[in-house]
Amino acid sequence: REEEKPFRDCADVYQAGFNKSGIYTIYINNMPEPKKVFCNMDVNGGGWTVIQHREDGSLDFQRGWKEYKMGFGNPSGEYWLGNEFIFAITSQRQYMLRIELMDWEGNRAYSQYDRFHIGNEKQNYRLYLKGHTGTAGKQSSLILHGADFSTKDADNDNCMCKCALMLTGGWWFDACGPSNLNGMFYTAGQNHGKLNGIKWHYFKGPSYSLRSTTMMIRPLDF
């Protein structure tokens, strides 16, 4: 019989009949090792590969370029998949991006982008997006005209300041832009008036730090 093809992403996992959310192993083009990822099979039809998740503040997101490059954390909880993996996955085919957010009052919202990919390391993992929709604000809280990725030890932003140092975490900062989902985790009651929190400007404003976030991608042709 025909040899089974390894899963390139969670869409492949879903289409192979595995429709329960959880951790799966995928094999990404041009990556030497397989990668464990969390697959969300429940939201909007399933097949989503989770590239970022925040939920409880248990993981430190104030890390350097190398760690954001290769990823950190555990797909069963808080984690960053890794820019190198995000680049490799989104180079395989066309992807969309969905971002699920929840505030400390229990309100949920999402932002979705019809096209999402990032550049390679030489391009500072530059963000490319198109077609924003969703309930987390009429305008996009991710920079649509493109922004380079910055970390505390790699200042690629568009500011006289050092956004990643000031706002903490690695992100596609502009100067410093309307979002930072990798900022400091603040608990309920401490989450207002924060310059360096988990921010999605067009959902909760410039200084409200969110309770949970999930960034996930899925092929356009799913």
């Epitope: 005209h145 568009n158 500011c159 006289m160 300041c161 000031m166 502009d174 100067a175 410093c176 832009g177 309307p178 008036g193 924060k194 310059l195 360096n196 400007h201 410039p206 200084s207």
Partner: antibody
Framework: EVQLVQSGGGVVQPGRSLRLSCAAS????????MHWVRQAPGKGLEWVSY????????YYADSVKGRFTISRDNAKNSLYLQMNSLRAEDTAVYYC???????????????WGQGTLVTVSS | DIVMTQSPLSLPVTPGEPASISCRSI???????????LDWYLQKPGQSPQLLIY???NRASGVPDRFSGSGSGTDFTLKISRVEAEDVGVYYC?????????FGQGTKLEIK
Amino acid sequence: EVQLVQSGGGVVQPGRSLRLSCAASGFTFSSYGMHWVRQAPGKGLEWVSYISSSGSTIYYADSVKGRFTISRDNAKNSLYLQMNSLRAEDTAVYYCARDLLDYDIWTGYGYWGQGTLVTVSS
Amino acid sequence: DIVMTQSPLSLPVTPGEPASISCRSIQSLLQSNGYNYLDWYLQKPGQSPQLLIYLGSNRASGVPDRFSGSGSGTDFTLKISRVEAEDVGVYYCMQGTHWPPTFGQGTKLEIK
């Protein structure tokens, strides 16, 4: 390159009006809060007025409240200061200044215009 | 309005020597988010002011590392480790914690 180019200064009699302009380029003007700061001859710096990125939030120093009006035209990348009922004590170099950070996050002034002199004298 | 007091008002320095400027506020500038909204600006002769330090201790891009800011609450200091001729001008501290923003009266640094 970020640039703030000012115009509109000059000599004006007390009680009269003047309008200052600040043309912005090299950045997404509509994403930044903008300010006017003035400096009387031989004196220090004094904040005058602020307008948020969308124009929805405006503040004035007590010394100019009711006489000065700050406005912006994001389509034209321009900031304005309409100065009415001018007094001798309004004589100063007026600077437009851009917030360091975008999206109305206040941390000070990242860029300044070249300044324009307003002289109120009879 | 918050009064910002700088000292000294005049600072003659020999090139290569260190310099220090103090800035005091009548109220704490430390916000609940952990940041002191205190900036330092330099106005060189005949020029517009330029940002040196933001949020108390963060050097703006392009500012030489001989400039450093420190302090928290009500007492802040700008230090220049080795003064150069191009550092002459008037230095202002500015607070942005309490609206409206207010400036210190300025410290004039000159070369001996």
